[in-house]
Interface confidence: low
């Protein structure tokens, strides 16, 4: 073709040229091109008009490209090109007119380019930039050029991994002068050991992101406190796991927070090992989202205290006892993959609608109720991954749940009542690996509007599939994969008019019947796939519904004998559903082991007597 | 296939091949060496993506003695205020870091474990690398 | 409110090993916080000797580093220090305390007199 | 380890009249500083946390300030009750360290 060796990912439109060992920018790729990936190549010099052949490129991925110089006008031609890529090119010279012509540029990636300052940055006319990454560079100096106040759509700014060590006044004056409320800014990673207080005073960004950028507790305070005046809307401090520095912080490292006007807050992988989260949190009292990250937590029964957090976010951090909460206005509450506190205890959160309380390895001794969670508001519930949860009530006072999810905890007393009779709204169910033993068809009673069902690795009595679906008029997804299933009622089925997907792979199945299945308007996946299947149960099998699109039966036993040559026959019919067909192979007799089904020519003659 | 030594400890020998066709370079060093009875130490990794990292996770597939285990997968970063600082890294841009790492160990048995590392990325998720490691675990050695 | 309470000999002969106890009633020492002890030479000033973390880690003054032990009872809710080898230099007003989060001590013991005397 | 250095070691001084008393530190502290009252037979109590931050419970004539090396802790009406040792003491890292102490005594 002719745009080889490139590959052609839309025609007309994406070529991708990577790692080619071009040395200069291919001709032959058709003009209409908007997408142009030509990273890894040693193109080393960009000249004048270097794209003039590709007038419509949009997006432009130069990266690792050996580029050491970019000539005045190097992409004069491309006036529509929204995203320029150049991470990890030694640039060396890059002359004032670069960038010209640009004109709807939004997205500049300059990572790695050994760029040592903002000031010589040839972007000041780029008025359409919304995006600006200047991560992983050679930048010592904060001070945001008065090019800036041209740049007036700008709404990502990435100085990460730079070397910047002070932060004073003069640096952010150009921001007083921009109309940007919508401004991120993330300067992790730098060694920041000075903010000059007041730098930041009548500043308002969306995010402000500080991770890794102290080495000593002290720095970080007095850091924290030169943030003083300044309103951002998410907050970002702490470390990553794989940088840490900072030793046991305590309360005093965060007081200057009181000085800044914050929305929402996120504290990441910092040890502190905190006595008095009221001391340490007052002044975060009123920010709307709350969050955690990683941080040793030891007295916990202070998250009573008046804070008017709607969200809270506590993720792998370490509990003593499952902590109190009474939270008035806390609409979301995300508790996961925390340690320590393994039994859950009541919680009074009259506001709360979403609750994820999964991978905590907790245990439950009765749920669940709006007394659990002090709420009837509730909409989601997680529980998934956690230990023993004995169901003592069928959500009485929780019927506004939507969406329920028990996977892979374990559950007592399923099979004693109806668990969801109260959940009329419910639509979205997952209690797949829930060592359930479904012994009761009431089980699922009550799920008037439940559109996705999970119940994948439970089990039946007696390995057979009874009537229990009876309420669940409007589901369309079903899992039973992993079940020990033999058999199924002939009428399991019959209410589910609107199924659209029905898994019913990896059980122990020997035979198929789509008697069961006629029933089902809207089925279009049926897989039957990892099973035992050597034939068919009866000897006129039925047409699927109509509706079927995909059918799977591959990793069965199919038996290639003359007796189940009508079975054979009739899959071959189905060849146009078949899903991976070619996988699809024989078991018995022995020597027609591992052929495809499909490819099989049984020609069977009455024997002769 | 050509084989990379990562290192040998008191109790394990490690190694690894590429199991993918690209076979971009990366560079592995683990100090001190893992010990399968239980070890903590430090993993430097330096590595230069082939596409962006953001959204990584790694799928497990791991045979004891030609036994394949169920099938891992763990989540490294989520898209967002990740956990590590390389879960920013972009296609082309040097990663050089260095993950602490310490388990408690479990009784292995003798013998050679396979752990096949699949990492997958992006989006729209591709492989950036495969990488199949050889475990082979002498518990009684010095 | 928590309370500290220490106890112990009164009068300890040079080369022994001074041992005390304080008892914990009001938080349990497993909960939180750190469990420290602070001595005071009669007429002379306060001197921070070391402390036990409510995980069970320990750190000393490195004055008093090849000489002291603090160990803790959960059991008793109680943490104790043990002294050895003592001269007459370590007669002094003995107090167990709690630190607060910024390495503050808000709650002490009444403290407790040991003479090392022979 | 720092070296809090207070002084003086000792005031005389007569009720409602203002004590000043400084403690230096040998290295830069932050406000990582606290200072404790102890009268006679009675264990420590403390006054001010983090240089200046009052306790609750506490007068308000006791004051704090300072930043980095040099505090100082302000009585501003001096009353009998105060008569008593005041300690600085240094939160800025192991081991803990105490200043040598000024006695206080009304005149």
């Known amino acids: 073709e002719s745009w080889e060796p490139c590959v052609e990912v839309v025609p007309n439109i994406t070529y991708q040229c990577m790692e080619l060992k071009f040395y200069k920018i291919p001709d032959n790729i058709p003009f209409s091109t908007k997408n142009l990936d030509l990273s890894f190549n040693p193109l080393r010099h960009l000249g004048s008009y270097s794209f003039l052949r590709f007038p419509e490129l949009q997006v432009l991925d130069l990266s690792r490209c050996e580029i050491q110089t970019i000539e005045d006008g190097a992409y004069q031609s491309l006036s529509h090109l929204s995203t320029l890529i150049l991470t990890g090119n030694p640039i060396q010279s890059l002359a004032l007119g670069a960038f010209s012509g640009l004109s709807s540029l939004q997205k500049l990636v300059a990572v790695e380019t050994n760029l040592a300052s903002l000031e010589n940055f040839p972007i000041g006319h780029l008025k359409t930039l919304k995006e600006l990454n200047v991560a992983h560079n050679l930048i010592q100096s904060f001070k945001l050029p008065e090019y800036f106040s041209n740049l007036t759509n700008l709404e990502h700014l990435d100085l990460s991994s730079n070397k910047i060590q002070n932060i004073y006044c003069k640096d952010l004056q150009v921001l007083h002068q921009m109309p940007l409320s919508n401004l991120s800014l993330d300067l992790s990673l730098n060694p920041i050991n000075f903010i000059q207080p007041g730098a930041f005073k009548e500043i308002r960004l969306h995010k402000l992101t500080l991770r890794s950028n102290f080495d000593d507790l002290n720095v970080m305070k007095t850091c924290i406190q030169g943030l003083a005046g300044l309103e951002v809307h998410r907050l970002v401090l702490g470390e990553f796991r794989n940088e840490r520095n900072l030793e046991e912080f305590d309360k005093s490292s965060l007081e200057g927070l009181c000085n800044l006007t914050i929305e929402e807050f996120r504290l990441t992988y910092l040890d502190c090992y905190l006595d008095n989260i009221i001391d340490l949190f007052n002044c975060l009292a009123n920010v709307s989202s709350f969050s955690l990250v990683s941080v040793n937590i030891k007295r916990v029964e202070d998250f009573s205290y008046n804070f008017r957090w709607q969200h809270l976010e506590l993720v792998n951090c370490k509990f003593e006892q499952f902590p109190t909460l009474e939270l008035k206005s806390l609409k979301r509450l995300t508790f996961t993959a925390n340690k320590g506190g393994n039994a859950f205890s009541e919680v009074d959160l009259p506001s709360l609608e979403f609750l994820d309380l999964s991978r905590n390895g907790l245990s439950f001794k009765g749920c669940c109720s709006q007394s659990d969670f002090g709420t009837t508001s509730l909409k989601y519930l997680d529980l998934s991954f956690n230990d023993v949860i004995t169901m003592s009530s069928n959500f009485l006072g929780l019927e506004q749940l939507e969406h329920l999810d028990f996977q892979h905890s374990n559950l007592k007393q399923m099979s004693q009542f109806s668990v969801f009779l109260s959940l009329r709204n419910l639509i979205y169910l997952d209690i797949s690996h829930t060592h359930t033993r479904v012994a009761f068809n009431g089980i699922f009673d009550g799920l008037l509007s439940l559109k996705v069902l999970k119940m994948a690795g439970n089990s039946f009595q007696e390995n057979f599939l009874p009537d229990i679906f009876t309420d669940l008029k409007n589901l369309t997804f079903l899992d039973l994969s992993q079940c020990q299933l033999e058999q199924l009622s002939p009428t399991a089925f019959d209410t589910l008019n609107k199924l659209q997907v029905l898994n019913m792979s990896h059980n122990n199945f020997f035979s198929l019947d789509t008697f069961p299945y006629k029933c089902l308007p809207s089925l279009q996946v049926l897989d039957y796939s990892l099973n035992h299947i050597m034939t068919s149960n009866n000897q006129e099998l039925q047409h699927f519904p109509s509706s079927l699109a995909f059918l799977n039966l591959t990793q069965n036993d199919f038996a290639c004998t003359c007796e189940h040559q009508s079975f054979l026959q009739w899959i071959k019919d189905q060849r146009q559903l078949l899903v991976e067909a070619e996988r699809m192979e024989c078991a018995t007799p022995s020597d027609k082991q591992g052929m495809p089904v499909l490819s099989l020519n049984i020609t069977c003659q009455m024997n002769k007597t | 296939q050509k084989h990379y030594w990562v290192c040998n400890s008191s109790d394990a020998s490690i190694s690894y091949t590429y199991c993918d066709k690209m076979q971009y370079p990366i560079s592995i060093n683990v100090n001190p060496c893992i010990k399968l009875k239980g070890s903590r130490g430090l993993l430097h990794i330096f590595y230069i993506p082939r596409r962006d990292v953001k959204q990584l996770y790694f799928n497990l597939y791991i045979t004891v003695n030609s036994m394949t285990l169920p099938k891992r997968k763990e989540v490294i970063c989520r898209g967002s205020d990740d956990d590590y600082s390389f879960c920013r890294a972009l296609k082309g841009e040097t990663v050089n870091t260095t993950v602490s790492f310490s388990f408690k160990g479990i009784k292995f048995s003798k013998g050679k474990y396979k752990c096949v590392v699949e990492a997958i990325s992006g989006s729209p998720e591709e492989m950036l690398f495969c990488l199949e490691f050889d475990i082979i675990h002498q518990p009684n050695s010095n | 409110q928590v309370q500290l309470q220490e106890s112990g000999p009164g009068l300890v002969k040079p080369s022994d090993t001074l041992s005390l106890t304080c008892a914990v009633s009001g938080y349990s020492i497993t909960g939180g916080y750190s469990w420290h002890w602070i001595r005071q030479p009669p007429g002379k000033g306060l001197e921070w000797m070391g402390y036990?973390?409510?995980?069970?880690?320990?750190d000393f003054n490195p004055s008093l580093k090849t000489r002291i032990t603090i160990s803790r009872d959960t059991s008793k809710n109680q943490f104790s220090l043990k002294l050895s080898s003592v001269t007459a230099v370590d007669t002094a007003v003995y107090y167990c305390?709690?630190?607060?989060?910024?390495?503050?001590?808000?709650?002490w013991g009444q403290g407790t007199l040991v003479t090392v005397s022979s | 380890e720092i070296v809090l250095t207070q002084s003086p070691d000792f005031q005389s001084v007569t009720p409602k009249e203002k004590v000043t008393i400084t403690c230096r530190a040998s290295?830069?502290?932050?406000?990582?500083l606290h200072w404790y009252q102890q009268k006679p037979d009675q264990s420590p109590k403390l006054l001010i946390k983090y240089a200046s931050h009052a306790i609750s419970g506490v007068p308000s004539r006791f004051s704090g300030s300072g930043s980095g090396t040099d505090f100082t802790l302000t009585i501003n009406s001096l009353e009998a009750e105060d008569a008593a040792t005041y300690y600085c003491?240094?939160?800025?890292?192991?081991?803990?360290?105490f200043g040598g102490g000024t006695k206080v005594e009304i005149k």
């Open positions: 036990i973390h409510y995980s069970g880690y320990t």
């Open positions: 003491q240094q939160g800025h890292s192991f081991p803990l360290t």
């Open positions: 290295q830069s502290i932050s406000d990582h």
């Open positions: 305390a709690r630190k607060d989060s910024g390495r503050l001590l808000p709650y």
